[in-house]
Every structure is written in C-alpha cells, then in structure tokens.
C-alpha cells in the first residue's frame, strides 16, 4: 500500500494531447502506474504509462489522436485515473473529472524568425502550434528578451493582450547579441496556464553607422 499525499495535475493542449504529472509522497517501489482517460461521451479511451521525472513524481502524455485533430471540446468531461499495479490487480491512486477547456496549456510557439533587424530595433514573428479553432482570436502572449550579462529570470515580460504573432522590440543596443522567447495562453479556462517558453531565438542588432570624417 502507498501512503502519503498525492497530487494529480493534467493539462489539455487544446487538440489531441493531455499531459499529466502525478506526485506521491509515500514510497513507491518498482510499481507500474498509468493514467487512464475515459471521456464522458466519446467512443474512445486512452492510456499512457507514467514514467519517473523525479524521486516522487511521474509524468505521461495521453496521445488522443493526430496532433491537429480536435479530440475534445468545451462540452467534454474526461475521467482521469492514476492506476498502479498491485499484484494482479490495478489500484486507483488518484481520480479527477477533468474539464479539458478549463485546464489548458498550449504547446510552445514555434517558427520564431527575425523579420527585420536594425541597429536599435528588431521585428520578430512566430506561429502557434496545435491550437484549437475554438479560441478564434482569444489568446494572449508574453515575450522576453535576454540581454548580455543578464538571466532569463531578470528579463522584463512584455505582454501582448491579443492574438498578435509578432513583436517589434525597441531601444536595443547596436551590434549586440540578444535572445528572444515567447509563450501563449488562451483566455479561456479557470485553471489554464501559460505554455512553455518557446525555443530561444538568437539575433544580433546591426552595428551603428560609422560617423563621417570632417
């Protein structure tokens, strides 16, 4: 038997993936555990094997279908269970009635690219990945720029309160190496959270023009 407190958290990427993390304080030996998803009105169910990510937490991804298929909608409720093997039987360790569109975490934005760069400014664009058509334009973004000698944690956050897949960074220093990241969040959902940060995009501003001799 497993004692101790348990935490079971899952997020829907808005298309065809539910990612789950299960934390358990009590000692689990070499027990095999899985997450089982049982929608309330769909003719499918899905299972994934929980794999350790730390001493006391396990994670897995429920792949519900093709990456861009809309497998769940706002009307769905999915019963999610953590099941662990106990001898020949499976024991329910955690259970939740999961409302996918109340627990959203999108995929990180992709295809970051420099559209135009000057000495003091840089225009960058990106794309969102595997985001549901249900959001229409109801998305927001956060961006941050890594300056030389600073850490990501120190970088000020720039907020875009609308679906705008580009940004013009101003007041940059000429001939300087920067990195840029962006993340996305739907406006919908009580427990919705930010996507992971995108892969950093490195860029360099142009050198200042040399002054003319008099």
């Amino acid at each position: 038997a497993v004692n101790g407190t348990s935490q079971f958290t899952c997020f829907y990427n808005s298309r065809a993936n539910i990612s789950c993390v299960w934390s358990q304080d009590g000692a689990l030996q070499d027990t095999s555990c899985q997450v089982h998803a049982w929608p309330d009105r769909r003719r499918w169910n899905q299972t994934c094997e929980l794999l350790p990510v730390s001493q006391a937490s396990w994670a897995c991804n429920l792949i519900l279908g093709a990456p861009d298929s809309q497998k769940l909608t706002t009307v769905d409720i999915v019963t999610l269970r953590v099941l662990c093997r106990e001898g020949v039987r499976w024991r329910v360790m955690a259970i939740q009635d999961f409302k996918p569109f109340e627990n959203l975490r999108l995929m990180a934005p992709i295809s970051l690219q420099v559209v135009h760069v000057e000495t003091h400014r840089c225009n960058i664009s990106w794309e969102i990945s595997q985001a549901s058509h249900y959001f229409e334009r109801h998305l927001e973004f956060e961006a941050r720029t890594l300056s030389p000698g600073h850490t990501w944690e120190e970088a000020p956050l720039l907020t875009l309160k609308q679906k705008q897949e580009w940004i013009c960074l101003e007041t940059l220093t000429p001939d300087t190496q920067y990195e840029f990241q962006v993340r996305v969040k739907p406006l919908q959902g009580e427990f919705t959270t930010w996507s992971p940060w995108s892969q950093p995009l490195a860029f360099r501003t142009k050198p200042a023009a040399l002054g003319k001799d008099t």
Epitope: D40, R41, R42, R43, S69, Q70, T73, T74, V75, H133, Y134
Partner: antibody, heavy 116, light 107 residues
C-alpha cells in the same frame, strides 16, 4: 441490449405542464448523458437539454431555460423531462436519446399535444 | 448558435443510384458531426458519428466525410429501405443543433 422506453402520449391544455419519462436498460445508466430532443409535426429536430444520471449535471438549451426541468431516478434507471407553461407550439414528439459517440440509441418518442 | 445548413432539402433518386447529401456548419465544428436516418412515425436512427465513423450494424454503403465546416453523407448504391429523411447534427458546442433534413424520395 440498450433500450430507452418512454412514457405514453399526453394531451395538455395551454399553460399546463407535462412530464415525460425515459427508462433505460442494457447499459450502465449513470455513465452516459441522456439528451432530450423534440420534433414538431413535419419539422426538424430540436435539442432541449441533457442530464448525466450519475452526477445529476444538466445542460439546457437556453431557449427552454426556466421552462424545462430534467431529473433522474437512479434506483429505477429513469430520466424525466418536465416542460411547463405549455403553448400550442410545444406540440411535438419528444425523444430521449443516449449520447455515446453521438446520439446512438433513441427512445420511441412521446407525443405531446397542446390544445385548448 | 451553430447553424447546420443541409442541401438539398429533397432529392429524388432510383434504386442503385449514388446519392450525396451535404451539410455546412456556420462555424468550425471539427469532426463532431453525426448523421441520422428517420422514417415516418419512427425515431431517428444513428448512422454516422465523428463525421466518418459508422455505427455497428449500419451498412457499408453509408459513408460520411468532412471536417471543419463542410460535411457529406454518401449512399453508394441506394436500396429500397434507404428512402427516408436524413439529418446532420453538430455536437461540438452548446446548444447542439441539427440540419433541417433532406427527404430522399423514389424517382
């Protein structure tokens, strides 16, 4: 096998209420949403609302909000739909249907006639 | 509300014909579309769910396709028992809605 059996035809006066029952068998009653759909004579299908017998959760079509009440009795695996303040345009066949994939099994229908 | 516009509203065909009925949703509904067959005085019968999946017991001559806003029900070779009214239905978001129906008659 899955069956949904509905109560018999009703004739009601305008302003009255009607309560239609739908008895389910052949599957785990608590597990699947039961929908209510109506069809006026010679017309199409109109969704009224749904109830999940296990939890009692309900979703209505806003068109019927305040006039429709859905309940369930888990001991008899029966769902009820009550429509109040009846008017002549409520004359229709009322169906219950299970939602699994889509509306997979349907009751035989209950004819409700509203006439003074 | 999402409107489901079915066409044609009526259709005359002969046994053995290939018949196509279309349904257009006013908003993207993914693949959350079903098709039903209804004969006079009877309850609707489920044919297709998730746009293209046939319920067990439904003859293979019935097929569904489409995603997003445009959907099709095809009957590859009409049989005498197929003459009926057909409805499309979206269950992607509340309130669930139906097409107005296509009446398939014998030519």
């Amino acid at each position: 096998q899955v069956q949904l059996v509905q109560s018999g035809a009703e004739v009601k006066k305008p302003g009255a209420s009607v309560k239609v029952s739908c008895k389910a068998s052949g599957y785990t009653f608590s597990r699947y949403w039961i929908q209510w759909v109506r069809q006026a004579p010679g017309q199409g299908l109109e969704w009224m609302g749904e109830i999940l017998p296990g939890s009692g959760s309900i979703n209505h079509n806003e068109k019927f909000q305040g006039r429709v009440t859905m309940t369930r009795d888990t001991s008899t695996s029966t769902v009820y739909m009550e429509l109040s303040s009846l008017r002549s345009e409520d004359t229709a066949v009322y169906y219950c249907t299970r939602h699994y994939g889509s509306f997979d099994y349907w009751g035989q229908g209950t004819t409700v006639t509203v006439s003074s | 509300d999402i409107q489901m516009t079915q066409s044609p509203s009526s259709l005359s065909a002969s046994v053995g014909d290939r018949v196509t009925i279309t349904c257009k949703a006013s908003q993207n509904v993914g693949t959350d579309v079903a098709w039903y067959q209804q004969k006079p005085g009877k309850a609707p019968k489920s044919l297709i769910y998730s746009a293209s999946y046939r319920y067990s017991g439904v003859p293979s001559r019935f097929s569904g396709s489409g995603s997003g806003t445009d959907f099709t029900l095809t009957i590859s070779s009409l049989q005498p028992e197929d003459f009926a009214t057909y409805f499309c239905h979206q269950y992607s978001s509340y309130p669930f809605t139906f097409g107005q129906g296509t009446k398939l008659e014998i030519k």
